[in-house]
Structure formats: structure tokens, C-alpha cells
């Protein structure tokens, strides 16, 4: 190889060891029998050398640095050449570095021809191995603007006081042009301006200077976004840190065409604007930091540009002004991430503050719109608390647990509507009365409706799940001892059509000691399946539950248990079951931890089934499943 650098070219070539391939033996640059691992060639020098190995690209890298001085004379503006030409260089990983020094008052603009650049974060690499590292200067301090790959949106970067651009090319890459030009501009009066051009839908992730380290103190950096007028842009902050400010405040400012309040100023922790039509600017302004404990300011954000959806022009009013203790959250439903570009899916408050999730609270009227290609990507979760603090005022008071029509009219599927029902301890209990009798969901008879009610204790220390219930069964009411949450969970979009079937009334009733009482009025046509609460995890220790089962005068009920033994093993106390005829008060008592469960039994009158648990040993829990079937009395049962 021969490298000859013209005099006055201000080019230095450095060949040095890269990261060695550990299993290989060292490779050397050989110059007239001398073996060396580093070779520096300066302007005006000509050097002939060879390598001592077959694959020097596995050992060495080459750096070609050109110093461009715009301080003492005119600047060579225009398209930047690769000098020396890549064809004259050994096939090593190459880094071309252009170091441009200019006066503070002169702006320098790097213009990137297509393909434009895409910024990458720490630890990321470019698929083709071609990277552009760009840094600027504040006095004597070097500031990293960022590292970029090809195929992005960044078209221009403006700086002042100098710029250092490093283009890294892998040894096998055929590229022989720099892909950028330098132009002079008037002073930009800030650290830098990055222009990002969108031709169509897409996204760009960008970072503050020096990211992930701190943005320089009291500096200003601007991003200019060029967006076709028919598209919409939304900004979301992926990662940010604030420093400790002594004077001024760290902030972002937006210049949004058409806005009457330009510049719009936001804190970094605010929701950032979305649904913006056309071009806009975003600026990051630092502050004077505390000298003792400066902290760091850094920002990584994403701009998503997409077609406005039909929904984005529709405003939905969610009137929660008459509601109390209620919150509504619209959020993305969990999905597997795909690698291809997925347009954003945002919900916007007052059409401008858009984010991927939004929580509305009671007491106000909210105007929302959607910026989303497919609203099935979102769902809605609502929580409402109904609490009674004064037992004298609440007793016998009833509340309808009904999803408000405002919510049902939104174009987003309702996932959960949870009512938290709170009562004063040991003073009142609750009764749930459905508009339509309920069926308990079991493996033997699953619910196939578009929604269910999930009933669970709302006492933090108590792990008690009564079960999942849907309309169309035999459970007439559910009484519970203390605080519970009732969640209406939807399973199909057809819930909108079936919404009329929902309806549950809760009443506050005098306190009782049992954890729960289910009132069951079986129909003659079907078998009723019932199971103990906390199925699969076992009825909690020392918990008692009852079923009040009605038997019509002309019917006989067959009570069947689906196991021979309960399987419970008691650590302390006894687990037992009482089956009691309501008319005669005659009762049978079974020791669940000792006896076998009763064989199918026939009941001519209404009866109680009461199950009380002991403190079981772990792994030997109490789970019981039983059924009740009605048959006409005329059938000979012998």
C-alpha cells in the first residue's frame, strides 16, 4: 500500500489497532522490516507499507482527519469529498473526520442528501455499519450532538463555532461519497438546530445533546419538523431527567403554526402536544444549574407522524360532572409488539394534549377525541367508589350499578367497570340484586355472555374472590359481609347490544357475620352449578359461606357434590358443612376434613347449605363444586 497526502491538505491518516480478534496472533504494519501497530501519516508525506497478516481488517482501523479552518480565511463550502479516495486506502474499517473551526458568530450547516439520517441511542448500532457522529463546540468544550444511521428524517444540522463530523464506514462498504455538504449561515444563537423532514407517515426518535449524559448548562437546542399539511404529528417523551436549577426553569417550547399562543411552553413532565397539523418547532431550554449538585438535564423523545383518522375530527363529551369518586382511563390494550412501523394510537383531551393513555376524573365535563388508526387498540377501564360512612344514613339505601350511557357511547370498548363498595366495619353489610338472575361461571358450565360480574373482597388483607357471574342463571342475590369490588368485565364488542341486560342494585343492609350468602332459585329446566369462593386457591381460613336454595312446592331438588372427599386438611379447628331443611330445621352436619361428602340427596323443601372452613395446611385447601337440579315431584324417585 502507498498513501501520499498532498502538502497543505490538512489531512492526517492514522492506522491503529482496533479491537483485536482474541484468538488471532497479532498483526503488524510492516515498513522496511519494522513491525509496528500504529502508523501516522501527515500532510506532505508518502509512506509505503504492508501488513503482516492476510486479514488486516480484523486487526486495524484507519482514521482520516481533515482540519478545515474557517477562522483565518474563506471556508471551503459545498459538497464534502472523501479524501483520499476510498479506493486508495487499505480495506480497513474507516473513519473520516472533518473538524471545522469557525468564529462564534458564524453558523455552519451540514446538509445530508437522501437517504437522510436517523439518530440512534447509546448501545444501538446501524444495520449497515455506517454511522455519522456529529459534535459541536462551546468554547473549548466538545458537545456530542448525536450518532446517526442512514434512512431517517434528519436532513440538516446547524451549529456555530465549529463542528466535528465523523463518518464511520466498515471495511466492506463500497461507499465513496461523504453524503453531505457544508454551507455557511448567519448565527443561530443556540447550540444547534436539527431539521427533520417527514415525506409521509413515520416516526423519529431524537435526543438532547450529550445524551445520555447531561445537556450543557443554560443552552438552547431546537428541532424543526417539516410535516406535510395533510398529516398529524404527536410528540411523546420517552425518557427525561431534570437538573437542579438555581436560576430559570428547564422547559420545552413549541412553535406551532396557527397557534395563538406561540411559543407554547411546557414542562418536561407535562403531556406533550399531539394531533399537530403541518410543520412545527420544538426547543429544549436548560437552566443555570446548582454548582454543588447540578444533576443532569437529558431528553429522549419520539415524534410520530400519521394520517388523521376519521375519529380525530370527532369530539366526544364525557360528562362526569354529576359523578363522585370515579375515574375513567382509556389506555392501549396489551398486544405483542410487532417490528414494523405501527401508527400511534392516541387519545386527546381538548384535541391537543394527546397521549397513549388518558385518565378522566369525576366532577367535570371532558371533551376528548382520538388520533388512532384502529380504535380496537384501545380499551376503557373505569373505577367508581360508593362508600357509606354513616350507617344510620345508609341503611336500606340502594344504588344502581349501571354503566353510564356517556361511557357506552364512546367509540372505545369498555374492558372493566369496577365499583368499590365500602361499608362501616361491623355495622353494615351489602346485598347485590341483579336485574336478571345470575349464573356462576364454572368449568362445567361456563358463561358465554358478552360480560360478567367479578365479585371480590375489597379488604386489602383479604384474598377472597367470590366468583364470576353472568346474566341468565339462578342466583337471585348475593349478600356479602363487608367491602367488596364488583367489576363488570366485557368479553365481546357485542356488549354494546347487550348493555340493557346489565343492571345490579346494591343495598346496605344490617351487618351479618357470614362472609357471603347466595340466594339461589333454580329453574326447572337447567342444572345449577355452584362453587365455593376462591376456587383453585381454596376458601380462606375460618371463612363461612352459605347458599339459600329455594325449592318450589311441586319440585324436588337433587343436591350433588362432585368429589368423594373435600381434600381439606386442617391445621387448627374443624371444617364442616351443614345441610339444613328450612321448614323443619332438620340438619345434617358433615366433617369436611374427615367424612366423605354426601351422596346425591333429594330435598322437597327449600334448604340451606353452609360451608365453614378451618385453618387448613398449605396445599390442602377447601374447594367444593356442587349442583342443584329440580325435577317434578310426580317422578317416582324410588
Amino acid at each position: 500500500f502507498e498513501i501520499a497526502l498532498p502538502r497543505e491538505s490538512n489531512i492526517t491518516v492514522l492506522i491503529k489497532l482496533g479491537t483485536p480478534t482474541l484468538l488471532a496472533k497479532p498483526c503488524y504494519i510492516v515498513i522496511s522490516k519494522r513491525h509496528i501497530t500504529m502508523l501516522s501519516i501527515k500532510s506532505g508525506e508518502r509512506i509505503v507499507f504492508t501488513f503482516s497478516c492476510q486479514s488486516p481488517e480484523n486487526h486495524f482501523v484507519i482514521e482520516i482527519q481533515k482540519n478545515i479552518d474557517c477562522m483565518s480565511g474563506p471556508c471551503p463550502f459545498g459538497e464534502v469529498q472523501l479524501q483520499p479516495s476510498t479506493s486508495l486506502l487499505p480495506t480497513l474499517n474507516r473513519t473520516f473526520i472533518w473538524d471545522v473551526k469557525a468564529h462564534k458568530s458564524i453558523g455552519l450547516e451540514l446538509q445530508f442528501s437522501i437517504p437522510r439520517l436517523r439518530q440512534i441511542g447509546p448501545g444501538e448500532s446501524c444495520p449497515d455499519g455506517v454511522t455519522h457522529s456529529i459534535s459541536g463546540r462551546i468554547d473549548a468544550t466538545v458537545v456530542r450532538i448525536g450518532t446517526f444511521c442512514s434512512n431517517g428524517t434528519v436532513s440538516r444540522i446547524k451549529m456555530q463555532e465549529g463542528v466535528k463530523m465523523a463518518l464511520h464506514l466498515p471495511w466492506f462498504h463500497p461507499r465513496n461519497v461523504s453524503g453531505f455538504s457544508i454551507a455557511n449561515r448567519s448565527s443561530i444563537k443556540r447550540l444547534c438546530i436539527i431539521e427533520s423532514v417527514f415525506e409521509g407517515e413515520g416516526s423519529a426518535t431524537l435526543m438532547s445533546a450529550n445524551y445520555p449524559e447531561g445537556f450543557p448548562e443554560d443552552e438552547l437546542m431546537t428541532w424543526q419538523f417539516v410535516v406535510p399539511a395533510h398529516l398529524r404529528a404527536s410528540v411523546s417523551f420517552l425518557n427525561f431527567n431534570l437538573s437542579n436549577c438555581e436560576r430559570k426553569e428547564e422547559r420545552v417550547e413549541y412553535y406551532i403554526p396557527g397557534s395563538t399562543t406561540n411559543p407554547e411552553v411546557f414542562k418536561l413532565e407535562d403531556k406533550q402536544p399531539g394531533n399537530m397539523a403541518g410543520n412545527f418547532n420544538l426547543s429544549l431550554q436548560g437552566c443555570d444549574q446548582d454548582a454543588q449538585s447540578p444533576g443532569i438535564l437529558r431528553l429522549q423523545f419520539q415524534v410520530l407522524v400519521q394520517h388523521p383518522q376519521n375519529e380525530s375530527n370527532k369530539i366526544y363529551v364525557v360528562d362526569l360532572s354529576n359523578e363522585r369518586a370515579m375515574s375513567l382511563t382509556i389506555e392501549p390494550r396489551p398486544v405483542k409488539q410487532s417490528r414494523k412501523f405501527v401508527p400511534g394510537c392516541f387519545v386527546c383531551l381538548e384535541s391537543r394534549t394527546c397521549s397513549s393513555n388518558l385518565t378522566l376524573t369525576s366532577g367535570s365535563k371532558h371533551k376528548i377525541s382520538f388520533l388512532c388508526d384502529d380504535l380496537t387498540r384501545l380499551w376503557m377501564n373505569v373505577e367508581k367508589t360508593i362508600s357509606c360512612t354513616d350507617h344510620r344514613y345508609c341503611q336500606r339505601k340502594s344504588y344502581s350499578l349501571q354503566v353510564p350511557s356517556d361511557i357506552l357511547h364512546l367509540p372505545v370498548e369498555l374492558h372493566d367497570f369496577s365499583w368499590k363498595l365500602l361499608v362501616p366495619k361491623d355495622r353494615l353489610s351489602l346485598v347485590l340484586v341483579p336485574a336478571q338472575k345470575l349464573q356462576q361461571h364454572t368449568h362445567e358450565k361456563p358463561c358465554n355472555t358478552s360480560f360478567s360480574y367479578l365479585v371480590a373482597s375489597a379488604i386489602p388483607s383479604q384474598d377472597l374472590y367470590f366468583g364470576s357471574f353472568c346474566p341468565g342463571g339462578s342466583i337471585k342475590q348475593i349478600q356479602v359481609k363487608q367491602n367488596i369490588s364488583v367489576t363488570l368485565r366485557t368479553f365481546a364488542p357485542s356488549f354494546q347490544q347487550e348493555a340493557s341486560r346489565q343492571g345490579l342494585t346494591v343495598s346496605f343492609i344490617p351487618y351479618f357475620k357470614e362472609e357471603g350468602v347466595f340466594t339461589v332459585t333454580p329453574d326447572t329446566k337447567s342444572k345449577v352449578y355452584l362453587r365455593t369462593p376462591n376456587w383453585d386457591r381454596g376458601l380462606p381460613s375460618l371463612t363461612s359461606v352459605s347458599w339459600n336454595i329455594s325449592v318450589p312446592r311441586d319440585q324436588v331438588a337433587c343436591l350433588t357434590f362432585f368429589k368423594e372427599r373435600s381434600g381439606v386438611v386442617c391445621q387448627t379447628g374443624r371444617a364442616f358443612m351443614i345441610i339444613q331443611e328450612q321448614r323443619t330445621r332438620a340438619e345434617e352436619i358433615f366433617s369436611l376434613d374427615e367424612d366423605v361428602l354426601p351422596k346425591p340427596s333429594f330435598h322437597h323443601h327449600s334448604f340451606w347449605v353452609n360451608i365453614s372452613n378451618c385453618s387448613p395446611t398449605s396445599g390442602k385447601q377447601l374447594d367444593l363444586l356442587f349442583s342443584v337440579t329440580l325435577t317434578p315431584r310426580t317422578v317416582d324417585l324410588t
Epitope: 489497532l17 482474541l22 484468538l23 488471532a24 496472533k25 519494522r34 513491525h35 509496528i36 501497530t37 503482516s52
Partner: antibody, heavy 116, light 106 residues
């Protein structure tokens, strides 16, 4: 397992030559530079030179150029170092070692005594 | 040629103490290698490529440095660490060794 076994101790007269051998096992000498160093009694290590068995290229410390000859026989995985015009100050333990970026395998050493 | 100067020539320390061995090059070196030698034995590879421990070398050893100044550090000396340590450069032939540092028991 990797080993470099050197030939036995030699006693030589001044002005004569000595040829020390170094047989490698457990690795391919083509993948290593085969170096020779020496250590005079109570002294430090002194690099003599190497051979690249892949292409038979050799390098010597200028101090030993013309007096030391390093060769290698790939077929027997053996490296040799011959030192001519011996003088009493050449009395030392001569070590061979194979080197790559990561691994360095050393022989046990051969004591060469030059005495009249 | 590149001259490597090791200092100190002798380091007298007690077990449990920290040892810092220095190797200074007369011109810039890409990587440095360290070897340990005990009396009557061949040198053993100890640190390769400036900072990587050779196989079997305890983690109390570390290597650092760049350019012309390199260091081998033993965080807490064990009895088996008392030996002579040599540095060697592979950046430019002849591939010289330092004069060695003897770490002896105080």
C-alpha cells in the same frame, strides 16, 4: 493439553554454536508467533526474536541480528533457535514461547553454559 | 526501540497490603503484557492486552493504563503473589521487556 518441550541443557565452548529445539503439542504453531527469549543468571528477560511459522518470516532484536537464526518445521511442530559465535555472556536459560493476542505458552527453558 | 522502565525495582510489602507496579514506555504502546516469574520457573502469562487476566489469575490482580504509562495492581497481597513481574510491549519490534519488579515479603 498445551505443552512446549525444549531440548536439554548444553555446555559449549566460546566461538561455537548451539541449536535449541522447542516441540509444541496441543496447539497449531501456525496460529502463533514462536518467540525466543533468554535470561542470564539473576537478570531479566531479553527478547531474541521470533518466527511466524505460517510464512517463515523472522524478526530479530538488532542485538542478535546475524548471530541468531530462528527456524520452524511445521510438520513436526518444532521451532529452533541457533546462536553462533558463543561467548561467556551468552550463558543463560533460553526460553521459547508461542504468542497470540490472548495466549502465551512457555517452554520449560534450556540452560546453555558457555565456558572454556 | 521502545524502552520499558519498571518501578520500583523491588517492592517490600506484607501480605494483605496493596501493591502497585508501574511500567513506563519511552514511546506510545498499543497494548502491554505482564508475566509472573518465580525462582527456578519459566515466566507465566499474567495479564494480556493491558487489562485482561490470563486464565487462572486471581481477581485481586488488575491491569490498567494506556499510551506510555501502565500499572499492575494487586489489591491485597497473598503469600503466593511474592514473585518477579515483567511487562512486555508488542507494539514495535524489538518486542522489549521491562527490567522486572520483585515483590518481596517485608
Amino acid at each position: 493439553q498445551v505443552q512446549l518441550v525444549q531440548s536439554g541443557a548444553e555446555v559449549k565452548k566460546p566461538g561455537s554454536s548451539v541449536k535449541v529445539s522447542c516441540k509444541a503439542s496441543g496447539f497449531n504453531i501456525k496460529d502463533y508467533y514462536m518467540n525466543w527469549v533468554r535470561q542470564a543468571p539473576g537478570q531479566g528477560l531479553e527478547w531474541i526474536g521470533w518466527i511466524d511459522p505460517e510464512n517463515a518470516n523472522t524478526i530479530y532484536d538488532p542485538k542478535f541480528q546475524g548471530r541468531a537464526t530462528i527456524t520452524a518445521d511445521e510438520s513436526t511442530s518444532t521451532a529452533y533457535m541457533e546462536l553462533s559465535s558463543l561467548r561467556s555472556e551468552d550463558t543463560a536459560v533460553y526460553y521459547c514461547y508461542g504468542s497470540s493476542y490472548r495466549f502465551t505458552y512457555w517452554g520449560q527453558g534450556t540452560l546453555v553454559t558457555v565456558s572454556s | 526501540e521502545i524502552v520499558l522502565t519498571q518501578s520500583p525495582a523491588t517492592l517490600s510489602l506484607s501480605p494483605g497490603e496493596r501493591a502497585t507496579l508501574s511500567c513506563s514506555a519511552s514511546s506510545s504502546v498499543s497494548y502491554l503484557y505482564w508475566y509472573q516469574q518465580k525462582p527456578g520457573q519459566a515466566p507465566r502469562p499474567w495479564i494480556y492486552l493491558t487489562s485482561n487476566l490470563a486464565s487462572g489469575v486471581p481477581a485481586r490482580f488488575s491491569g490498567s493504563g494506556s499510551g506510555t504509562d501502565f500499572t499492575l495492581t494487586i489489591s491485597s497481597l497473598e503469600p503466593e503473589d511474592f514473585a518477579v513481574y515483567y511487562c512486555q510491549q508488542w507494539s514495535s519490534n524489538p518486542f522489549t521487556f521491562g527490567g522486572g519488579t520483585k515483590v518481596e515479603i517485608k
